[in-house]
């Protein structure tokens, strides 16, 4: 079942700055992400940002910057201008829509332990740090192994030369001594990604995420909508309208890294405009 994870964190440098991280775990491509606060989308929540994988982002104060982190996760930076820090007690919700397969929404808030008055702000999600740790660990093991091997070879060199046929057991012992510490890294020499793929990365990228992005675990509530359907066309956006003056079906430049099928073009006699209006349904 598809799931949505939400993580809210306070910036270590600025206590008035908050970042909301949201991600979608599941098959299918995302057609729209909505971030709201104060409650779920359509249930009293106030929109903070709307992100489309290809058409861009729209945001409303106090949202500072909304962006895609991967093809299935987003981040939203918030600027808390008030001294009372209302974000600390606010619920943030993320809704991932995949039209018309369904939409899934989950909410989260700043953990109580990260209250600036009680403890230091939490560190960011260690997605990159885990990879870095893997690389450093691998390098360390290799360096240690090489150093140890050199040490052994040097020791052999300075020993008085034995008879031409050393004992079979000694030879085996030397080999074992030299390579035992770096056995783990030996596999990495044949498969350089073996130890770099940390727990944050899917084991088989095409089964976990076709796009090969890392994902995090979560607790989620989902709201499936509509029957299942899927399609793919190399135009622009999944389930979106576009108006162009001449009404012709044109390819709008190269596709960005976010893949999304299906776009229909709509002629607009007045040319392109950005409408920041309100369409309320009560």
């Amino acid at each position: 079942t598809p799931e949505v994870w939400v993580q809210v964190q306070m910036e270590a440098t600025e206590l008035s700055s908050f970042t909301v991280h949201c991600g979608f775990l599941g098959p299918g491509s995302i057609s729209l992400v909505t971030v709201s606060w104060g409650g779920p989308d359509g249930a009293g929540g106030t929109k903070l940002a709307v992100l489309h994988p290809e058409l861009g982002t729209r945001q409303w104060a106090p949202a500072r910057q909304a962006r895609w982190e991967t093809q299935s996760s987003i981040s939203l930076a918030l600027e808390d201008s008030g001294a009372s820090s209302p974000f600390a007690n606010t619920t943030f919700c993320c809704k991932f829509a995949s039209f018309p397969e369904g939409s899934w929404e989950s909410c989260g808030s700043l953990p109580p332990s990260s209250d600036p008055g009680l403890s230091a702000p939490p560190t960011p999600v260690p997605i990159l740090r885990a990879d870095l740790a893997g690389i450093l660990g691998l390098s360390g093991v290799l360096l240690f192994g090489c150093g140890y091997l050199l040490h052994l070879l040097r020791r052999q060199k300075h020993r008085p030369t034995p008879r031409l046929q050393p004992s079979h057991t000694n030879s085996q012992a030397l080999t074992a001594q030299a390579w035992a510490p770096s056995q783990a890294s030996q596999a990495a020499l044949h498969d350089p990604y073996a130890t770099i793929n940390t727990s944050f990365c899917p084991a088989t990228l095409d089964t976990a995420h076709p796009n090969g992005w890392a994902s995090l675990p979560t607790h989620a509530a989902h709201q499936p909508q509509g029957p299942a359907a899927s399609a793919s066309t190399p135009i622009l956006a999944r389930g979106s309208f576009v108006s162009v003056e001449n009404g012709l079906y044109t390819q709008a430049g190269e596709r960005p890294p976010h893949t999304g099928p299906g776009l229909t073009l709509f002629p607009d006699c007045r040319g392109p405009r950005a409408v920041e209006g309100r369409f309320g349904v009560r």
Epitope: L32, T34, H52, G280
Partner: nanobody, 120 residues
Framework: EVQLVESGGGLVQPGGSLRLSCAAS????????MGWFRQAPGKEREGVAH???????RYVESVKGRFTISQDHAKNSLYLQMNSLRAEDTAVYYC??????????????WGQGTMVTVSS
């Protein structure tokens, strides 16, 4: 939560007419477009028509002059009048509310869909 319920689909002969209705309930905060998408069996889904918050309708080229989109704010309803129907109009029709990106309308909520079959 937003609820969109479509009705009015059915079987019609080529050249015939149908009127689809969409009843909306709940509230969509800062949603600024509403329209109809369709998904034909084994085909790419496409936007059929939508109305911005300014009330201006837009249509896909293939339905221009045949389909008319309208809304009734008092009844919280959206309509799609379909005339001169063709076999290629056969599809599941979805009522959607969404967000504008320039002149794009990206669906944020939608209904379960209503089937329209044009066949003799």
């Amino acid at each position: 939560e937003v609820q969109l319920v479509e009705s009015g689909g059915g079987l019609v002969q080529p050249g015939g007419s149908l009127r689809l209705s969409c009843a909306a309930s709940g509230y969509t905060s800062r949603t600024d477009c509403m329209g109809w998408f369709r998904q034909a069996p084994g085909k790419e889904r496409e936007g059929v028509a939508h109305i911005d918050s300014d009330g201006i309708p837009r249509y896909v080229e293939s339905v221009k002059g045949r389909f008319t989109i309208s809304q009734d704010h008092a009844k919280n309803s959206l309509y799609l009048q379909m005339n001169s129907l063709r076999a290629e109009d056969t599809a599941v029709y979805y009522c959607v509310v969404g967000f504008k990106f320039g002149d794009y309308c990206a669906p944020n909520d939608w209904g379960q869909g209503t089937m329209v079959t044009v066949s003799s």
